[in-house]
């Protein structure tokens, strides 16, 4: 056979359907590798090729599309299952070609169980709600294209296993489910069921997404630097461990980067001749706000280095905000103190200077 | 001396995958950003991918999101770039860099890797 | 996407002289704007950070100014190794985003 452009086993794009439930899948070739659409293929003389692999086998077959009931089918440039059963798991292909002309790519198709409650291996879409916003919506996703606007489905909605009747907030608007105010309690998985007749025969479609409700917009605030603060003097003697942390909340914003970073004198610790080390850990609240600690240390601090100024700088879509450690170089206690002590029959040890938090 | 040495690069077909690395050396890895750049024979840079210097966060351009995934292991002090569903038009030189914070700009590169994605 | 646009793309220029690059924004980007000097076949290099600051170990006939949407990196007296494509990048946000270069030819 003549050469083929093979775009080879299209994994980003790893399709997941529920067994004996319709599905309609397009060929990849022309959402994602070609210039031009079917519709430009077809006028241009060019056929479109679908076969499969059967999972564990390495025989590519053509499709049957001679089975009852035309359970399998092609329409333009999409394939049909009306419905799909558990072996129709594989890699499958399209192949757009002619005489003159070839291109192909084959994508993974897994027909997957679920159970009463709807658990399955599917992996679920995330929706992010914002906490006490006002109404906000889901809609039944990926349901376009299987039945004509003129037929009206049915849709029954879901939260868990529990069909949504009677909710406080949660209300159920056809393919719509409006959340009248967003909680933490209405985190959870969220099941649309859209059944639909077609050529006498009833046909289920099954859409799950989990809900995550997250930080407001009209709560966010730029950064806030917890530590250093002017409560906290890291006060040192020369040769002893500096520990400084930055602890900074951010809130919840989406697509933000967030960024923490120290600065001595102004540069970059690796532009000071010292040995620096930073370690950084991030942690999330429930409505994913974040809270990221950077530790700068120095493993045995030099009365020079007690001079300098260390700054911690954070930054997200918010704003940037930086605040300066108080540094200092422990003072020891004068010899005449110790003398006086003596000289007045003192019997306790003398103590050092007292800070109001010491580190 | 700070360096940064990319590996991986190669010939691969359209719809291939290929896996590039990063090796660096001269400063403390881990509390570094990290990001890959690339640039088409001929035309200017394009980012492509950054990751926070505990490999928490990872940012995408566009035209990459779902298809390359940007990693670290900072105790081999090498960051990855995973590429997979090449497309023509990822050919390019891909260059790995350093950031402190997104203040000091892109402060070292690597001498970067050569993709070409044809078939 | 915040877009950037460098001018002019090309220009020459003779040693010694002052040259000046602008650099637009298509939105406010503050001080989070870098400039980097690229040769044939090699790897891009930092020259100025934060709109104004030099890099370390960047000749000080390098400058940069501007902040906002408006920037420009000026060198003061040419010389021959600087001879090569400037860009200016945006790191305020993700995407970061690059200027489609300037070529300094000799003239």
């Known amino acids: 056979s003549e050469r083929c452009d093979d775009w080879g086993l299209d994994t980003m794009r790893q399709i997941q359907v529920f067994e004996d439930e319709p599905a309609r899948i397009k060929c990849p070739l022309f959402e994602h590798f070609l210039k031009f659409n079917y519709s430009t293929a077809h006028s241009a003389g060019l056929t479109l090729i679908w076969y499969w692999t059967r999972q564990d086998r390495d025989l590519e077959e053509p499709i049957n599309f001679r089975l009852p009931e035309n359970r399998i089918s092609k329409e333009k440039d999409v394939l049909w299952f009306r419905p799909t059963l558990l072996n129709d798991t594989g890699n499958y292909t399209c192949m757009l070609r002619n005489t003159t002309y070839c291109s192909k790519v084959a994508f993974p198709l897994e027909v997957v169980q679920k159970d009463s409650c709807f658990n399955s291996p599917m992996k679920l879409p995330v929706h992010k709600l914002y906490i006490e916003y006002g109404i906000q919506r889901i809609t039944c996703p990926n349901v376009d294209g299987y039945f004509p606007s003129s037929v009206k489905p049915t849709i029954t909605w879901y939260m868990g296993c529990y069909k949504i009747q009677n909710f406080n907030n949660v209300i159920p608007e056809g393919m719509n489910l409006s959340f009248l105010i967003a909680f933490i309690s209405n985190n959870g998985n969220y099941t649309c069921v859209v059944t639909y007749p077609e050529n006498g025969r009833t046909f289920h479609l099954t859409r799950t997404l989990t809900v995550k409700v997250v930080g407001s917009p009209k709560n966010a605030v730029p950064p806030v630097i917890h530590s250093p603060n002017d409560h906290v003097v890291y006060e040192k003697e020369p040769g002893e461990e500096l520990l400084i942390p930055c602890t900074v909340y951010f809130s919840f914003l989406m697509d933000s980067r967030n960024e923490v970073w120290w600065t001595i004198d102004g540069k970059k610790p690796d532009d000071i001749p010292i040995d620096v080390t930073i370690n950084e850990s991030i942690s999330h609240s429930r409505t994913e706000d974040e809270t990221r600690t950077q530790i700068l240390s120095i493993k045995k601090v030099t009365s020079e280095d007690l001079k300098r100024s260390y700054v911690c700088h954070a930054r997200s879509a918010k704003g940037e905000v930086a605040k300066a450690a108080t540094v200092k170089q422990k003072v020891p206690a004068p010899r005449y103190t110790v003398e006086l002590a003596c000289g007045f029959g003192a019997t306790g040890s003398g103590s050092g200077s007292h800070h109001h938090h010491h580190h | 001396e700070v360096q940064l040495l990319e590996s991986g690069g190669g010939l691969v077909q359209p719809g291939g995958s290929l896996r590039l690395s990063c090796a660096a050396s001269?400063?403390?890895?881990?509390?570094?950003?990290m990001s890959w750049v690339r640039q088409a024979p001929g035309k200017g840079l394009e980012w492509v991918s950054a990751?926070?210097?505990?490999?928490?966060?990872?940012y995408y351009a566009d035209s990459v999101k779902g298809r390359f995934t940007i990693s670290r292991d900072n105790s081999k002090n090498t960051l990855y770039l995973q590429m997979n569903s090449l497309r023509a038009e990822d050919t390019a030189v891909y260059y790995c860099?350093?950031?402190?914070?997104?203040?000091?700009?892109?402060?070292?590169w690597g001498q970067g890797t050569l993709v070409t994605v044809s078939s | 996407d915040i877009q950037m646009t460098q001018s002019p793309s090309s220009l020459s220029a003779s040693v010694g002289d002052r040259v000046t690059i602008t650099c637009r924004a298509s939105?406010?980007?503050?001080?989070?704007l870098n400039w980097y000097q690229q040769k044939p076949g090699k790897a891009p290099k930092l020259l100025i950070y934060?709109?104004?600051s030099l890099q370390s170990g960047v000749p000080s006939r390098f400058s940069g100014s501007g902040s906002g949407t408006d920037f420009t990196l000026t060198i003061s007296s040419l010389q021959p190794e600087d001879f090569a494509t400037y860009y200016c990048?945006?790191?305020?946000?993700?995407?970061?985003?690059f200027g489609q270069g300037t070529k300094v030819e000799i003239k």
């Open positions: 939105q406010s980007i503050s001080s989070y």
């Open positions: 990751i926070s210097g505990s490999g928490g966060s990872t």
């Open positions: 990048q945006q790191s305020y946000s993700t995407p970061l985003t």
């Open positions: 860099a350093k950031e402190w914070s997104s203040y000091f700009g892109l402060d070292y």
């Open positions: 001269g400063f403390t890895f881990s509390n570094y950003a």
């Open positions: 934060a709109a104004s």
